[in-house]
């Protein structure tokens, strides 16, 4: 008897996550059943289901499967965090490359090679043809998207709309193109699920056909999601265990990637003295730790045994006994000669000067001539040349070309935090330039703090839902959860985009990250029809010294009565004095038994001057910063409020005009709180929703 | 009044498998997170995990995932912690502590001596 | 890991006195730092969260200061009550972790 084949590798699954339809119209199907692997075998053969499955659901708790024609990409769907949930999706649905020939590719790609719009499969216009949907059932030829029904030499192609064109292939790369990787590849976190030769890969949360002990949930950090190739064991290159049992593992072809492509785990910039960022490319020889302990050497196992070898980290440097950051860590480190301390920190090396000696700009850099073309966080400026279509979008004067000259650092825009340049980087189109305002400079980027010149409202009214405005309604207000629990507190500003503090993100991997919109309690608890869990697929920190973040959702937030965003308020605008406003948050409260109920604090806005005096001369304000004190004695943004907003009405409308980050002590009596003035870094903020990639509804 | 009550002093041989509690009273029992922390006779403390009661979400610390396991019950408001195999360097006082958010770990349990010895 | 360096391991100090413990992180915890105060065979108790904000019903001779690094509690005029070790902690970042404790005895 044939064994059936074990189709759940072809699911990339998201733990602890759903779906839910808003669609009433899609359709689902379930069934009780022991295992996700009898729902993935069932979904690929489409077996007594009356759709073509895309994705499916196990529910361990009632060991149930939901079959779904629809994936987390369609429309009328939405993701949710549910701890009895994991979800998966066929990786032929949600691919955007081909494997081989392309037979299996489903993608949504309809346009072809030269550009020409694919005519649909179901239609006869403008070409005759024998390939119908019905004709060619589980081979997906769906609307007009490219396919390869036969599996013919030259990948997936479709019939055109131009009657001139019978067909034409699709230009859609290669799996293998697309991937790619840097050194060997122990940061790899792609998409590659075949080996060179051509052998799926075994899921690593599975022990069949090849036991073994690369358990996702032991080894949490090093990506092992689904059956992708990775390198967690310093081997010269990604691999996997294969699901041919004679064969246990294989090397995977992922090619290396070319100069020019950057990813968050290429080293920047290489120093010896200094650190820049996080200290990924510093070749110095300092050998001991911030306490004085001394380095091991990296090519020893005593006194501590471990993998960070110079064998294993082929790109890292990993010399001597010198503090390296092979791993991404916060700072170079290095393992220690002390048996008793494993690890320690190189805190001593300091951070590389960010005015590059005599190097500086006066106001706000518009003037800059300097020639340093490289962005704070090391990547090398593009052309301005190459950039002037995307300029003038978010320009509405034509820039001084001569200024424009190379790839320097400038400032075309006005932009009020200093010289920048586009990067060439997708991920980064463009960022500030590491360059300070030149000492003694004390020309003002807004005028007039004081006095209310412009006014922070838009002159448009408060969205109102039948009928009624909605004043009490507080659906911007975001929950960050690191590793599921309350972190902090963030504004939507926009569908795709959440507004934060830096400190709100004590770790680098973003999987670790969710953000829970729509919900009054803090753990959900009755919060169930209205949350919206999104996870985040990039952070955007601000100008130097803002302490703010945009983060990215991974996908738009669906705007519905639950999640609403909020306003940002006029670039440089003043709240006059006394104005009521107010702080959100499910931070501390001081109350011995908190319910996790979303808690309010009101607030009223106080002069940069008189709130100075409040903080007895200690705090000197400036124009990024905006100040509130307490109507009640002892209220106020505490730990879990930070990163949430200080909200003000004005003409009926509301505006974040704060963000709370922490500062000096929780709710002190008669210490008004100090909040990253919005207004100060608005215009950053549009260019950022301007100018960033953001996923498509 | 708050308080957190744990289970009685326990003495174990290697090998053996154990469970201890923690009751909460006077407060949301599935607002706040209950956190384990070991003292070693001497010593220091040592975070090993925490469990959000309503959901039963776990994160531990590297160095005690795999020995312990840590859970609760919502129903009767009672968080634990088990070994289903105890080793001699398990013999430490046990401490559960709520925190609902940052550092705030504001009661403590009065603590469960754990003593494991052949 | 991050480490948490306290120091002095132990000190002597009569009452009345002022006494100062510092504990260093190894890296940024931004000021998600707390001091705890233990008694032979009690559990320790929370004297101060969020590095400065001291808990309900503690005493106003404790204090805390510091962020990002480097953190400080500082006791204004000993009291016999308030010889004990004490401990800071880190709860920024998973796992969290403690410093290795100060104990504070009689002169």
């Known amino acids: 008897q044939r064994k059936r084949r074990n189709t759940i590798h072809e699911f990339k699954k998201s733990a602890k996550t759903t779906l839910i339809k808003i669609d009433p119209a899609l359709k689902i199907k379930t069934k009780k059943v022991n295992t996700a692997d009898q729902c993935a075998n069932r979904c690929t053969r489409n077996k007594g289901l009356p759709f073509t499955c895309k994705a499916f659901v196990f529910d361990k708790a009632r060991k149930q499967c939901l079959w779904f024609p629809f994936n987390s990409m369609s429309s009328g769907v939405k993701k949710e965090f549910g701890h009895e949930f994991d979800l998966y999706e066929n990786k032929d649905y949600i691919r955007n490359c081909i494997i081989g020939k392309g037979r299996s590719y489903k993608g949504t790609v309809s346009i072809t090679k030269s550009g020409i719009k694919c005519q649909p499969w179901s239609s006869m216009i403008p070409h005759e043809h024998s390939f119908l949907p019905s004709s060619y059932r589980g081979k997906d030829l769906q609307e007009n998207y490219c396919r390869n029904p036969r599996g013919e030499e030259g990948g997936p192609w479709c019939f055109t709309s131009n009657p001139e064109v019978r067909y034409e292939v699709c230009d859609i790369p290669q799996c293998s193109e697309v991937e790619c990787m840097t050194c060997n590849g122990e940061s790899y976190r792609g998409l590659m699920d075949h080996t060179e030769s051509g052998k799926i890969c075994q899921r690593w949360d599975h022990q069949t056909p090849h036991r073994h002990k690369f358990l996702p949930e032991r080894y949490p950090d090093k990506g092992f999601d689904d059956n992708y190739c990775r390198n967690p064991d310093g081997q010269p290159r990604p691999w996997c265990y294969t699901l041919d049992p004679h064969t246990r593992w294989e090397y995977c072809a992922i090619k290396t990637c070319a100069d020019n492509t950057m990813n968050d785990t290429d080293v920047p910039l290489e120093t010896t003295e200094c650190i820049q960022g996080q200290g990924e490319g510093y070749r110095g020889t300092v050998n001991t730790i911030w306490n004085g302990i001394p380095c091991q050497r990296w090519d020893s196992q005593y006194p501590h045994e471990h993998d960070m070898t110079p064998e294993n980290f082929k790109c890292k440097d990993l010399r001597e006994n010198y503090c390296r950051n092979p791993d991404g860590s916060e700072s170079p480190w290095c393992f220690t000669t002390d048996p008793n301390i494993r690890v320690g920190y190189c805190s001593q090396i300091p951070n590389c000067d960010m005015s590059h000696g005599q190097d500086c700009y006066r106001g706000n850099g518009k003037n800059y001539m300097g020639n340093l073309s490289q962005t704070r966080s090391g990547l090398t400026c593009s052309m301005w040349d190459k950039n002037m279509e995307d300029l003038h979008r978010h320009i509405f004067w034509e820039p001084d070309a001569s200024k424009l000259n190379e790839n320097y650092c400038r400032n075309p825009d006005d932009d009020a935090h200093g010289p920048w340049c586009y990067t060439g980087n997708p991920l980064i189109p463009w960022d500030y330039c590491p360059i300070s305002r030149c000492e003694g400079d004390t020309t003002p980027t807004i005028v007039n703090l004081d006095h209310p010149v412009i006014s922070c409202a838009k002159t448009k009214q408060l969205r109102v839902v039948n009928g009624i405005p909605t004043r009490t309604n507080i659906g911007w207000m975001v929950s960050l959860r690191y590793r599921n629990k309350h972190i902090c507190g963030g504004s939507l500003i926009k569908e795709s985009w959440v507004l934060t503090a830096r400190q709100c993100f004590p770790s680098r991997d973003l999987k670790d990250y969710e953000a829970w919109l729509g919900i009054h309690d803090v753990h959900g608890r009755g919060d169930e029809k209205c949350k919206q869990v999104l996870n985040v697929s990039q952070l955007v920190y601000g100008p130097e010294g803002s302490d703010l973040v945009l983060m990215k959702l991974a996908r738009p937030a669906v705007l519905d009565d639950f999640v609403s965003t909020i306003d940002l308020p006029n670039y440089g605008c003043t709240i006059p004095e006394k104005t009521s406003c107010s702080v959100y948050g499910w931070g501390y409260t001081g109350l011995i038994n908190y319910d996790g109920l979303l808690r309010v604090a009101h607030l009223y806005i106080m002069g940069n001057e008189k709130c100075s005096q409040h903080h007895r001369g200690k705090v000197t304000l400036n124009e990024s910063e905006i100040c509130a004190g307490a109507e009640k004695i002892g209220s106020g943004p505490c730990e879990g409020d930070y990163g949430g907003p200080l909200v003000c009405e004005q003409h009926k409308m509301r505006m974040v005009l704060g963000v709370i980050v922490p500062g000096r002590g929780c709710a002190i009596p008669n210490r008004p709180g100090i909040f990253v003035r919005v207004a100060y870094y608005a215009k950053w903020i549009h260019k950022i929703i301007l100018t960033y990639k953001v996923p498509q509804s | 009044e708050v308080q957190l009550v744990q289970s009685g002093a326990e003495v174990k041989k290697p090998g053996e498998s154990l469970r201890i509690s923690c009751k909460g009273s006077?407060?949301?029992?599935?607002?706040?997170?209950m956190h384990w922390v070991r003292q070693m006779p001497g010593k220091g403390l040592e975070w090993m995990g925490e469990?959000?009661?309503?959901?039963?979400?776990?994160n531990y610390n590297p160095s005690f995932q795999g020995h312990v396991t840590i859970s609760a019950d919502k129903s009767i408001s009672t968080a634990y912690l088990q070994w289903s195999s105890l080793k001699a360097s398990d013999t430490a006082m046990y401490y559960c502590a709520r925190n609902y958010v940052g550092s705030i770990f504001d009661y403590w349990g009065q603590g469960t001596l754990v003593t494991v010895s052949s | 890991d991050i480490q948490m360096t306290q120091s002095p391991s132990s000190l002597s100090a009569s009452v009345g006195d002022r006494v100062t413990i510092t504990c260093k992180a190894s890296?940024?915890?931004?000021?998600?730092v707390s001091w705890y105060q233990q008694k032979p065979g009690k559990a320790p108790k929370l004297l101060i969260y969020g590095a400065s904000n001291r808990n309900t019903g503690v005493p106003s001779r404790f204090s805390g200061s510091g962020s990002g690094t480097d953190f400080t509690l500082t006791i204004s005029s000993l009291q016999p009550e308030d010889f004990a070790t004490y401990y800071c902690?880190?709860?920024?970042?998973?796992?969290?972790?403690f410093g290795q404790g100060t104990k504070l005895e009689i002169k």
């Open positions: 469990i959000n009661p309503t959901n039963g979400h776990t």
């Open positions: 006077g407060y949301s029992f599935t607002t706040y997170w």
């Open positions: 890296e940024n915890v931004v000021s998600y």
């Open positions: 902690g880190q709860s920024y970042n998973y796992p969290y972790t």
